[in-house]
């Protein structure tokens, strides 16, 4: 059974990057509001974003409790101005989300090159370790803390004067590469989880950083 003049939500979609996770849906409400519930496969439903006129709900606080669980959400539709009444027995229309497993499905955020340092014909390029909202003992964990050796970085580098790119890979956050003396190079990195088989296997490329700019230093 439905509730008068309300329509069920549709197109429920998870948007998640580095475990920051938002559920989005349609339609934009006309004379109705929404409440979201989330649960693990074996857990109880927990309500979030009570009677909201938004079409999104930030569920990060729930999924970071265990990023390796599989979650299901549902969105209930209520008439605008709805107040919870103990006597109401009519179940409002709702729609279920697809299942969502953060560890396997969260997108990797765009990485940042923290620094690069040239010593002779070697350059050490360091990738910044991104913080997530996943906690351990009240301490936020980095992307590396969560994924460990599942996470690698690919470095693309090229001479400023040419377009031919070379690549290097590391399962740490550092690269040590050989360069030609006297040449300036540009760098870009990409985060990769090789064990994934889906489109979210790779991040977007980092902003390009080039030698001769403030992030790098050079020593003979």
């Amino acid at each position: 059974s439905g509730t008068t003049n309300t329509v069920a939500a549709y197109n429920l979609t998870w948007k998640s990057t580095n475990f920051k996770t938002i559920l989005e849906w349609e339609p934009k409400p006309i004379n109705q509001v929404y409440t979201v519930q989330i649960s693990t496969k074996s857990g109880d439903w927990k309500s979030k974003c009570f009677y909201t006129a938004d079409t999104e709900c930030d569920l990060t606080d729930e999924i970071v409790k265990d990023v390796k669980q599989t979650y299901l959400a549902r969105v209930f539709s209520y008439p605008a101005g709805h107040v919870e009444s103990t006597g109401s027995t009519e179940e409002p229309p709702y729609e279920n989300s697809p299942e969502f497993t953060p560890y396997l499905e969260t997108n990797l955020g765009q990485p940042t090159i923290q620094s690069f340092e040239q010593v002779g014909t070697k350059v050490n390029v360091t990738v910044q370790d991104e913080w997530t909202l996943v906690r351990r003992n009240d301490t936020f964990l980095s992307l590396r803390d969560v994924f460990g050796k599942d996470l690698i970085y690919t470095l693309y580098y090229w001479k400023s004067s040419s377009s031919g790119k070379k690549t290097a890979k590391t399962n740490t956050n550092e690269f040590l590469i050989d360069v030609d003396k006297g040449e300036n190079y540009c760098f870009s990195v990409q985060a990769v989880i090789p064990s994934r088989r889906t489109a979210n296997r790779k991040s977007t490329d980092s902003p390009v950083e080039c030698m001769g700019h403030e992030k790098g230093e050079s020593r003979e």
């Epitope: 669980q69 599989t70 497993t101 560890y103 360091t126 590396r144 050796k149």
Partner: antibody
Framework: EVQLVQSGAEVKKPGESLRISCKGS????????IEWVRQMPGKGLEWMGD????????NYNENFKGHVTISADKSISTAYLQWSSLKASDTAMYYC?????????????WGQGTLVTVSS | DIVMTQTPLSLPVTPGEPASISCKSS????????????LTWYLQKPGQSPQLLIY???TRESGVPDRFSGSGSGTDFTLKISRVEAEDVGVYYC?????????FGQGTKLEIK
């Protein structure tokens, strides 16, 4: 409660095939690596390889690559270690283990082991 | 491959006394991104499966008695037992959990004197 239950002991002849299993329960099977570890009689631990059941992605120790195959059936939360042609030197205890919650946090749970004896 | 070397290979200890096991890796196990050392310690009691004691070089696994502690960084690591008890007998293994292939030390057999 997290549990890994392995299949029973096997006695085989050289050249025969074998598949042993490891059934996980009490956790989300698809998001944790299942590791396989060999322990030959009176010897130490050797990592053979692992699988992430959610994607089927595997890693192998080069010493075992081509001789064993690691697979998983996520619908029944079970991982497998198989040989197409056993050798006498495969006689060992084989353990499956589950990775920890955090990255690179060790093998947090272990199965009871499957003893494989290969003898003519 | 990273080679893990443990010393001693045999360790006779009197109950109530401390014990120390050293583990050296052929390459650094320190992750530059988060400054964690990916070194793990296990205990295999006689006739049992191994059990996780310590990960990230110094983080005790839940349920492991606080008489066990891990320390070290880079390539040199130590497992200490502050007061050995009879139930601590078995073989202790360190493990490279930093990069594939994952490798174990040869094991240190702790026995009661």
């Amino acid at each position: 409660e997290v549990q890994l239950v392995q299949s029973g002991a096997e006695v085989k002849k050289p050249g025969e095939s074998l598949r042993i299993s490891c059934k996980g329960s009490g956790y989300t099977f698809i998001t944790y690596w299942i590791e396989w570890v060999r322990q030959m009689p009176g010897k130490g631990l050797e990592w053979m390889g692992d699988i992430l059941p959610g994607s089927g992605s595997t890693n192998y120790n080069e010493n075992f690559k081509g001789h064993v195959t690691i697979s998983a059936d996520k619908s029944i939360s079970t991982a497998y270690l198989q040989w197409s042609s056993l050798k006498a030197s495969d006689t060992a205890m084989y353990y499956c283990a589950r990775s920890g919650y955090y990255g690179n946090s060790g093998f947090a749970y272990w199965g009871q082991g499957t003893l494989v004896t290969v003898s003519s | 491959d990273i080679v893990m070397t443990q010393t001693p290979l045999s360790l006779p200890v009197t109950p109530g006394e401390p014990a120390s096991i050293s583990c050296k890796s052929s390459q650094s196990l320190l992750s530059s991104g988060n400054q964690k050392n990916y070194l793990t310690w296990y205990l295999q009691k006689p006739g049992q499966s191994p059990q996780l004691l310590i990960y990230w070089a110094s983080t005790r696994e839940s349920g492991v008695p606080d008489r066990f502690s891990g320390s070290g960084s880079g390539t040199d690591f130590t497992l200490k037992i502050s007061r050995v008890e009879a139930e601590d007998v078995g073989v202790y293994y360190c493990q490279n959990d930093y990069t594939y292939p994952l490798t174990f030390g040869q094991g240190t057999k702790l026995e009661i004197k």
